[in-house]
Amino acid sequence: ELCDDDPPEIPHATFKAMAYKEGTMLNCECKRGFRRIKSGSLYMLCTGNSSHSSWDNQCQCTSSATRNTTKQVTPQPEEQKERKTTEMQSPMQPVDQASLPGHCREPPPWENEATERIYHFVVGQMVYYQCVQGYRALHRGPAESVCKMTHGKTRWTQPQLICTGEMETSQFPGEEKPQASPEGRPESETSCLVTTTDFQIQTEMAATMETSIFTTEYQ
């Protein structure tokens, strides 16, 4: 059920998964001058049961110059730090994928990790897009792409996002002179939350084992 291709590229936009479906793999890559420890994991795998998902295996890097004397530091899985047993959802808030069964949060960094992360996504994975600095979205609502299985092949849906350049005079997209207001919250901003049904998690299943490689700059 691995996705064949990478998520679509949108000009002047980057994308990120808010959570990773069970079955997602993350390559254990080390930065220059370091390598995986001998007998170390090749990848981390998002696994779980009906109530809890977490990353199996742990990536460990050691200096290429040393044999095997380097002390390794293993960070705590992010699920243990961040997972809440119950998270109250505001009725106007979209579902937080990472709080649902069957999804792992972003894995925490490991020591001497490469700057680029290579993910292998599975069917049902959703990624969200955001325009890069200096560009604004024509529509600010969430722009997502989902890996779907149709007729035995996987494909990513096309995100509805156009990032347009701004005049050089503005600091960054949307910069304008704000109106003065006596209190912290401007009067025009009282009830402006946008909702959409597109947030619902895709639950399609599939049965293909071809690989999709996705690289992302890890911040």
Epitope: A13, T14, K16, M18, E87, M88, Q89, S90, Q93, P94, D96, A98, Y128, Y129, Q130, C131, V132, Q133, Y135, R136, A137, H139, R140, G141, P142, A143, E144, L161, C163, Q171, F172, P173, G174, E175, E176, P178, Q179, S181, R185, P186, S188, E189, T190, S191, C192, L193, V194, F199, E217, Q219
Partner: nanobody, 127 residues
């Protein structure tokens, strides 16, 4: 009920540092762009800094670039503003704000993009 609570303000001498914190409750924090704004006495509200929900982008007003940094901790539902090399003109009430739109497909420096606001914390920089 969305609540943003700022802390960390105070009186500091010019050249000093302060770290402002903003605790968010009642919203899915990791899905929102977060920003800091400020209002000096007798002036209009001014954008200071923002950080995107995907933590891939941080933006700063020209007046604070190189002096202020913004960060967030999605595990603790916190956003921070580290202010170094403070100047008297940085004196203002600083407000934490959350974007109207979860998973917004861009960032904005305009106050109208932010629908949730804290009560503010006073920062005074003496010369």
């Amino acid at each position: 009920q969305v609540q943003l609570v700022e802390s960390g303000g105070g009186l500091v001498q010019a050249g000093g540092s302060l770290r402002l914190s903003c605790a968010a409750t009642g919203l899915t924090f990791r899905q929102h762009n977060m920003g800091w704004f400020r209002r000096a006495p007798g002036k209009e509200r001014e954008f200071v800094a923002a950080i995107s929900w995907n933590v891939g982008s941080t933006y700063f007003a020209d007046s604070v670039k190189g002096r202020f940094t913004i960060s967030r901790d999605n595990g603790k539902n916190m956003v921070y503003l580290q202010m170094n090399s403070l100047k008297p003109e940085d004196t203002a009430v600083y407000y934490c704000a959350a974007d109207n739109i979860p998973l917004a497909s861009d960032m904005r420096a305009t106050a109208t993009a932010y629908g949730y606001w804290g009560q503010g914390t006073q920062v005074t920089v003496s010369s």
